[in-house]
Each structure stands twice: as C-alpha cells, then as structure tokens.
C-alpha cells in the first residue's frame, strides 16, 4: 500500500484540534488494518507508541491520548485514514506514523510520517541580572520563558526617556534572551522590559537596574 501524507510539518495551536492527513490507494480487503502511532521528539521510530488501531471493522483507540483521538472517516476504508486529535497539549508535539496494511498489496511499506508541532504562546518570562552594576562595569540581563512553541524570540527595551547609549554598550541576543550592558554609567539606571514573542503571542517581564558609584553597586 502506498500511503500519502503532507510533506510539510503540521502546526496546531494549543487546545485546538489537529487533523493529521493520511490517504492511500488499495483495494481494501477483509485483512485491511490501520495503525496510528506516536514518537516523541528526538526519539527513534522504533520507540513509537500506538495510539489507535483499526482492524476487523473495529476501531481501538489506545494509550494516553485515547480519549482525544478519532478518525475523520470511520471506517477508514475509502482511502482516507486521517487522524483527528482534539484539545492538543504541548506533549502532543512529535512524529505521528500512519501505517496501512492490506495484504496482498505489498507495493510499499505503507508508512507515512507527519511531524506535529503544538503552538504554545510564550509563558511570562523570568527576568534576572548578573554582573557588576557599578559605574564602568558590565552586567547581563537575562530573560527566559519556560513555555513557548516555536521558541520565542526575546527583545529588550529600556522604558522611559533616557540618553541614547553609546554604540556597542548595549548588545542583545534575541535567541538566548540576554542583554549585555557594558561601560555602565549612572544614566544606564532605569527599568528594562523583555518581551518574549512567537506566532502565538507575547509575554513580558521587567527589571529595574540601579547603577551606583564604585563599591556601592546593587540591583533593586
């Protein structure tokens, strides 16, 4: 049986229903069987876990997703083996295997793989700071969301009115969420906001930096 699945990965927002399209062409016999299984990201196909079987005219959802899985067409004998997964969770991200078996049609292995990413908005990030906060020193402001798919990008902004920092004294990494401030001056003091953003939304945290004369540096 030759199975057809989309070549592009599938993305579904948290809590919505994912439709994993799988079609095939075969003269369905009484021995026809369909199995859907799931592999966590980074794991080999051999470690897949079954989530649904169809055989002998009956549907058997199984495993931890059993209450949330169904078939778009039941029985799936018309050439459509599409799986519906409701109320998607972050843990549903991974690879789904659609396997159709219909002896004596052994034209190919009857296997199709679909990568699903559950889209999750960034959680409220945690803002932190380390380094010397005295005049002339350097400090690193860090920002990290524990949740978010795809991985959020981070952008730091300084709130309020302030003199433009000298070039190179403020360098940020959008991927790691780190802002490096060098050659600190008293005017570097203020509130800094980090905004974590992905296609599902954004979340932010703020941190107040107090730059002091040497030997008095601290963060409020």
């Amino acid at each position: 049986v030759e199975v057809k699945v989309p070549t592009e990965p599938l993305s579904t927002p948290l809590g919505k229903t994912a439709e994993l399209t799988c079609t095939y062409s075969t003269s369905v016999g009484d021995s026809f069987a369909l199995e859907w299984s799931f592999v966590q990201p980074g794991k080999p196909i051999s470690e897949s876990h079954p989530i649904l079987y169809f055989t002998n005219g009956h549907l058997y959802p199984t495993g931890s997703k059993s209450k949330r899985v169904s078939l778009l067409q039941n029985p799936p004998t018309v050439g459509v083996a599409t799986l519906k997964l409701t109320d998607v969770h972050p843990s549903d991200t991974g690879t789904y295997l659609c396997q159709v078996n219909n002896p004596p049609d052994f034209y190919t292995n009857g296997l199709g793989l679909i990568n699903l990413t559950v889209l999750v908005p960034p959680s409220n990030p945690l803002c932190s700071q380390s380094g010397q906060t005295s005049v002339g020193g350097s400090t690193a402001l860090r920002c990290s969301s524990s949740e978010g798919a795809p991985k959020p990008v981070y952008n730091w902004v300084r709130l309020g009115t302030f003199p433009t920092p000298s070039p190179g004294s403020m360098v940020q990494d959008e991927v790691s969420g780190q802002l490096i401030l060098t050659n600190l001056s008293l005017t570097s003091s203020g509130t800094y906001r980090c905004v974590a953003t992905n296609q599902m939304g954004s979340a932010s945290c703020e941190l107040t930096l107090s730059v002091t004369e040497p030997s008095q540096g601290r963060v409020a």
Epitope: K4, T23, S25, T26, S27, V28, G29, D30, F32, N56, G57, P75, T77, V78, G79, V80, P104, D105, Y107
Partner: antibody
Framework: EVQMVESGGDLVKPGGSLKLSCAAS????????MSWVRQTPDKRLEWVAS????????HYPDSVKGRFTISRDNGKSTLYLQMSSLRSEDTAIYYC???????????WGQGTTLTVSS | DIQMTQSPASLSASVGETVTMTCRAS??????LAWYQQKQGKSPQLLVF???TLPEGVPSRFSGTGSGTHFSLRINSLQPEDFGSYYC?????????FGGGTKLEIK
C-alpha cells in the same frame, strides 16, 4: 480464463426493485475485491458499489447509497447487487468487475441491462 | 468527489497515425489513474494503471504519462483494432470516478 457473467437485467417500473447476479470463474474469487460499474445510455461510466474479498467492507457513491446493496457468496463465486427504489436515471448496462490490488478494474463481465421506465 | 475531465470528446485519425488524448483530475490524484478501451458493443478493457503501467498483453504502442492532475494516453502507429472509446478513471479515494470518454474514429 477469467470469466464473469452477469444476469438479472430487466425492465422495471420506477420505485421497483431488482437483484443482479454475476457468476465468476477462472480466478480465486474469494481473494478478490469486486465492484459493479454501470454505463448509462449516454455512454458514461459510473462505479456503483464495491465489496472486499470476504464481504466485510462495502462502499457506494452517494447516488445509490441506501438504495443499492452489494453482497457476495464466495462458496458459489457469485456477486450480487440488490437494487431498490429504482429511478429512471438508474437505467444502464451493469457490469461486474474485478478489482486489481489497486482499485482499478482489470476484468469486466459482458454486462446486463436494466431499464427503469413506466 | 474528484471530477475527471477528458478531452477531446471525439477524435478522427487514420491507421498509422499517432494520437494523444488527455485526462484532467479536479484535484491531485498522484499517479492513481487507469485508462480503459471500449469497442462498440463490448465491455471496457484495462489498458493502463498507475498512470503508466501496461498490463500484460497490452501492445507497447499504448503509453500513459502524467501525475498530479494532468494525464495523457498516447497511441503510436494506430491499428484498425484501436478505434473505439477510451475512458480514464482515478483509483485514489472513494468514490472512484471516470472521465466522460474520448471517441476515437477512423478518418
């Protein structure tokens, strides 16, 4: 030699019923998916029913669903099509056809004619 | 449902000529296409399946090509027995549907 012989075609009034038969030989009938395909007076071909090798799965297009029933008797190597609530648009030559491993039709019978008219 | 459209509806040609007819699907059917030949008063006969595979016994002057939504059947060096009607059929998802046919007549 693969052979399929249809029978049972007739002139029927609208709303009537009829059962067609197809006697197969020359191949292992019990291992083959089978279908009925009809050809309307304007020469168009339309698939009307299919059944899996052991009869577990049957499929129909919307045009006949609920009115036509396909069945088989593997002991007699015979395929059937029970038709009810017949309409004038069901007028056609009905062919019995064997399916390949994929759902194309590799052998066809000679056909039997159904005419639905008052 | 997937609609199958054949063109031309009719075609006149002479023995020895080469002809091509086309079949278009309303959506992607990959290579799941069959062609049939039907002579006057006879039942259809399978000519091609999987878009380009010829069953045993079909002469090599017949050839099928295409994938996705566009397909064609070519007959090289027409023989007298090639005249009749030709139908395409998708063998992807149910319902399986046929094109309206191309009638090949002797010029």
């Amino acid at each position: 030699e693969v052979q399929m012989v249809e029978s049972g075609g007739d002139l029927v009034k609208p709303g009537g019923s009829l059962k067609l038969s197809c006697a197969a030989s020359g191949f292992t009938f019990s291992n083959s998916g089978m279908s009925w395909v009809r050809q309307t007076p304007d020469k168009r071909l339309e698939w009307v029913a299919s059944i899996s090798d052991g009869g577990l799965y049957t499929h129909y297009p919307d045009s006949v669903k609920g009115r036509f029933t396909i069945s088989r008797d593997n002991g007699k190597s015979t395929l059937y099509l029970q038709m009810s609530s017949l309409r004038s648009e069901d007028t056609a030559i009905y062919y019995c056809a064997r399916q390949g491993v994929r759902p194309f039709f590799d052998y066809w019978g000679q056909g039997t004619t159904l005419t639905v008219s008052s | 449902d997937i609609q199958m459209t054949q063109s031309p509806a009719s075609l006149s040609a002479s023995v020895g000529e080469t002809v091509t007819m086309t079949c278009r699907a309303s959506e992607n059917i990959y290579s799941y296409l069959a062609w049939y030949q039907q002579k006057q008063g006879k039942s259809p006969q399978l000519l091609v399946f999987n878009a380009e595979t010829l069953p045993e016994g079909v002469p090599s002057r017949f050839s099928g090509t295409g994938s996705g939504t566009h397909f064609s059947l070519r007959i090289n060096s027409l023989q007298p027995e090639d005249f009749g009607s030709y139908y395409c059929q998708h063998h992807y998802v149910i319902p399986w549907t046929f094109g309206g046919g191309t009638k090949l007549e002797i010029k």
